[in-house]
């Protein structure tokens, strides 16, 4: 808290500019006038103040608006933007997707802070969902990001919004958010043709359920491992390993170096060993010839 | 994190000269390039001298046309040279700078002292 002194004769700023810098913090606080700092906001970010001065012209506007800031001053934050902390931005009404890009930008580079988490929450909740433009600009800025949403905010994501998805954005998702994320995609690449769409769908299989791996079986999309690996082990253990052979192509090849691993381990010992004989690729660990295999879980739905 | 050590204080004659040196343990990112500051006793640490990233300087009123700051990049060192030292100049001397993360670093300091 700076204290209140009387602005030294001559120094009362009639604008906001690099004059100031070698200003001391009461000085700031006595001379530069809060309304004036607030219409030429613009400026502060070209002047090289230390934060220890940025501190002084926040407590000004801080002041001047114990509301919360308006856009207009929002918008031209720059590194003030440092010095605000989560509960300053929760009182901030941001709709501008400008804003939001020149506030990020303060942070490019870097982890996500708690600051930039709580804007981005108080944008979102503004727009009431996640829309194209708003993942866009998010995934550019965090790759993560999506994978940091709960699958009930991941809810709100429209199938349209999909499109900006890139594979590294969903790097760090678990199962339960690739679950809400990969009905989604399957809209919204509906309408592409085969070769296209598993290009696109990919990333998400990670949420794809049995008859839609069955499916792709049958396109020769030839899958690779760490796809794969990532499919849910409840949607991998019903395919036969013919399905699993047509799925994979090419890449079938790769079974034997993940055999100790999930799903692979899982789906091995489901499977007939003379079934995995044929793919000739020493996997062992099946069913052995002259076992029945009952189906529990089918025999428990019937009765 | 980076170290800021000052160097090249001591006690002068009015009219006479300095040369400070403020060394960096390493490369520094900042935001505002690097500033010698200065704190007088009882009073509070005021603006020298900057140079941004750049190269532009810019000075204070009081010791415009007497100070220099200026850069060596290859040792990782800022300089200011003070000329036609005055009485008001007493006071200790830091150099510092402001990260891209909302924190500013400073030196310990060195002491300059004009008296006759």
């Known amino acids: 808290e700076v204290e209140k002194t009387a602005c030294p004769s001559g120094k009362k700023a009639r604008e906001i500019d690099e004059s100031l810098i070698f200003y001391k913090k009461w000085e700031l606080e006595a001379c530069v006038d809060a309304a004036l700092l607030a219409t030429q906001m613009d400026r502060v970010n070209a002047i090289p103040f230390t934060y220890e001065q940025l501190d002084v012209l926040k407590h000004k506007l801080d002041e001047l608006y114990p509301q919360g800031y308006p856009e207009s001053v929002i918008q031209h934050l720059g590194y003030l933007f440092l010095k605000m902390s989560p509960e300053d931005i929760r009182k901030w009404n941001v709709t501008s997707l400008e804003t939001l890009k020149a506030l990020l930008e303060v942070n490019k580079g870097h982890e996500m802070s708690p600051q930039v988490a709580t804007l981005i929450d108080r944008f979102v909740k503004g727009r009431g969902q996640l829309d194209k433009d708003t993942l866009d600009t998010l995934t550019a800025f965090y790759p993560g990001y999506l994978c940091s949403l709960s699958p009930e905010e991941l809810s709100s994501v429209p199938p349209s919004s999909i499109w900006a998805v890139r594979p590294q954005d969903l790097d760090t998702c678990d199962p339960r958010q690739l679950d809400v994320l990969y009905p989604k995609a399957r809209l919204a690449f509906q309408n592409m043709n085969g070769s296209e769409y598993f290009v696109k769908i990919q990333s998400f299989l990670g949420g794809a359920p049995t008859e839609d791996l069955k499916a792709l079986s049958q396109q020769n999309v030839s899958m690779d491992l760490a796809t794969f690996m990532k499919l849910r082990t409840d949607a991998v253990l019903p395919l036969t390993v013919a399905e699993v052979q047509k799925l994979l192509g090419p890449h079938v090849e790769g079974l034997k170096a993940e055999e100790r691993h999930r799903p692979v381990r899982d789906w091995i010992l489901r499977q007939r060993q003379d079934d995995l004989d044929t793919l000739g690729l020493g996997l062992q660990g099946g069913i052995p010839n002259g076992y029945l295999v009952l189906d529990l879980s089918m025999q428990e739905a019937l009765s | 994190q980076v170290q800021l050590v000052e160097s090249g204080g001591g006690v002068v004659q009015p009219g006479g000269s300095l040369r400070l040196s403020c060394a960096t343990s390493?490369?520094?990112?900042?935001?505002?390039?690097m500033g010698w500051f200065r704190q007088a006793p009882g009073k509070g640490l005021e603006l020298v001298a900057r140079i941004l990233n750049d190269g532009t300087t810019m000075y204070a009123d009081s010791v415009k046309g007497r100070f220099t700051i200026s850069r060596d990049n290859s040792k990782n060192t800022v300089y200011l040279q003070m000329n036609s030292l005055r009485a008001e100049d007493t006071a200790v001397y830091y150099c510092g700078y402001s990260d891209y993360r909302g924190t500013d670093y400073w030196g310990q300091g060195t002491q300059v002292t004009v008296s006759s």
């Open positions: 390493g490369t520094i990112f900042s935001r505002n390039g």
